[in-house]
Interface confidence: low
Amino acid sequence: AVNGTSRFTCFYNSRANISCVWSQDGALQDTSCQVHAWPDRRRWNQTCELLPVSQASWACNLILGTPDSQKLTAVDIVTLRVMCREGVRWRMMAIQDFKPFENLRLMAPISLQVVHVETHRCNISWKISQASHYFERHLEFEARTLSPGHTWEEAPLMTLKQKQEWICLETLTPDTQYEFQVRVKPLQGEFTTWSPWSQPLAFRTKPAALGKDT
């Protein structure tokens, strides 16, 4: 970046999307900026329009193809540039050589559902979305359960160190409303980060049978 402090961060969802955020102190809010993607060994290139997400940061998604198409591999390098319009010209504000499989952030898990619920336990399953077949089974998950009277931030994290798309929650309180979220991360990639949390799944444990200890 030419003026101010610039930060340009991008993640690959492992299939056909690169999401980028560009932050620039002192940048003009009404400037038109784009992200340009130029792979080193492929015939396509792609552009997206940066849209403001806060006072000094912009974001956009490079859509490389249909959601489940494998557009990049572990060996691709994509040159990413932030280009901003200055009058009739475009000025390069930031650049990075982007290694997609070193900068992974998968889509949030989907299709959360209660498989079986009892008084003290609940079995929940989910599916991963738009995840590359290159990972094989090398994924890990984090899950959290929201209990009454607590916040998500207070919820303890449960770690699943393998590709396991289900969990059995134990020691729950009978006849109680809970919410559950899960996120996923590939084991591959130096700068890989967790996916966003899934949409919360609400469920209620069964009431304890009358006359039984709870």
Partner: antibody, heavy 119, light 106 residues
């Protein structure tokens, strides 16, 4: 113990097809990719293609028009079919599996099956 | 395709000798492997990811290098090391092997 066992080799007429099987044990083909590599007599190794755990395939572009790799998860077996065979396809055909990660190299190999293309 | 060129094509050395094989890639590669193949046998993985020793492989075998230039070394040649050695890249498809280096005992 991880084992790969190829079968289906033998004599094939020029212009014919071959279908090889690779029976896996000690792991499941729904969890690991299986690759095919061949070696012509007195020659080096040549990578032909791979079937990933989810069933997707990547092929060597030199063979893509006449090569199909498939699998039967219930039998834990991977299949290799090549059409329009010619004399230069005479080789020992191996199936191989990487280590725990795709980039751990071919840690496990079958014993190989010889395919001879001749009239 | 990435071409992998090994040198020498063959070599003859005495037991206890240090043996070095080089592998040159036509373009930069990230993941390089070395295999040993004894006559009539399937290849055996010796080195993965350039310099890591595969399970059960003696420590006399080693690998190094980066970019386009890689080296495989047997620090002290043993009679059981008579074989052909191959390098292989796993940086882009198709995966490609070197043409092999045949190692014999003098």
């Amino acid at each position: 113990e991880v084992q790969l066992l190829e079968s289906g080799g033998g004599l094939v007429q020029p212009g014919g097809s071959l279908r090889l099987s690779c029976a896996a044990s000690g792991f499941t083909v729904t969890s690991y990719a299986v690759h095919w590599v061949r070696q012509a007599p007195g020659k080096g190794l040549e990578w032909l293609g791979v079937i990933w755990s989810g069933g997707s395939t990547d092929y060597n572009a030199a063979f893509i028009s006449r090569l199909t790799i498939s699998k039967d998860n219930s039998k834990n077996t991977v299949y290799f079919q090549m059409n329009s065979l010619r004399a230069e396809d005479t080789a020992v055909y191996y199936c191989a599996r990487a280590g725990d990660y795709n980039y751990d190299g071919f840690a496990y190999w079958g014993q190989g099956t010889l395919v001879t293309v001749s009239s | 395709d990435i071409q992998m060129t090994q040198s020498p094509s063959s070599l003859s050395a005495s037991v206890g000798d240090r043996v070095t094989i080089t592998c040159q890639a036509s373009q930069s590669v990230s993941f390089l492997y070395w295999y040993q193949q004894r006559p009539g046998k399937a290849p055996r993985l010796l080195i993965y990811d350039t310099s890591n020793l595969a399970s059960g492989v003696p420590s006399r075998f080693s690998g190094s290098g980066s970019g386009t230039s890689y080296t495989f070394t047997i620090s002290s040649l043993q009679p059981e090391d008579i074989a052909t050695y191959y390098c292989q890249q796993w940086s882009t498809y198709p995966l490609t092997f070197g043409q092999g280096t045949k190692v014999e005992i003098k």
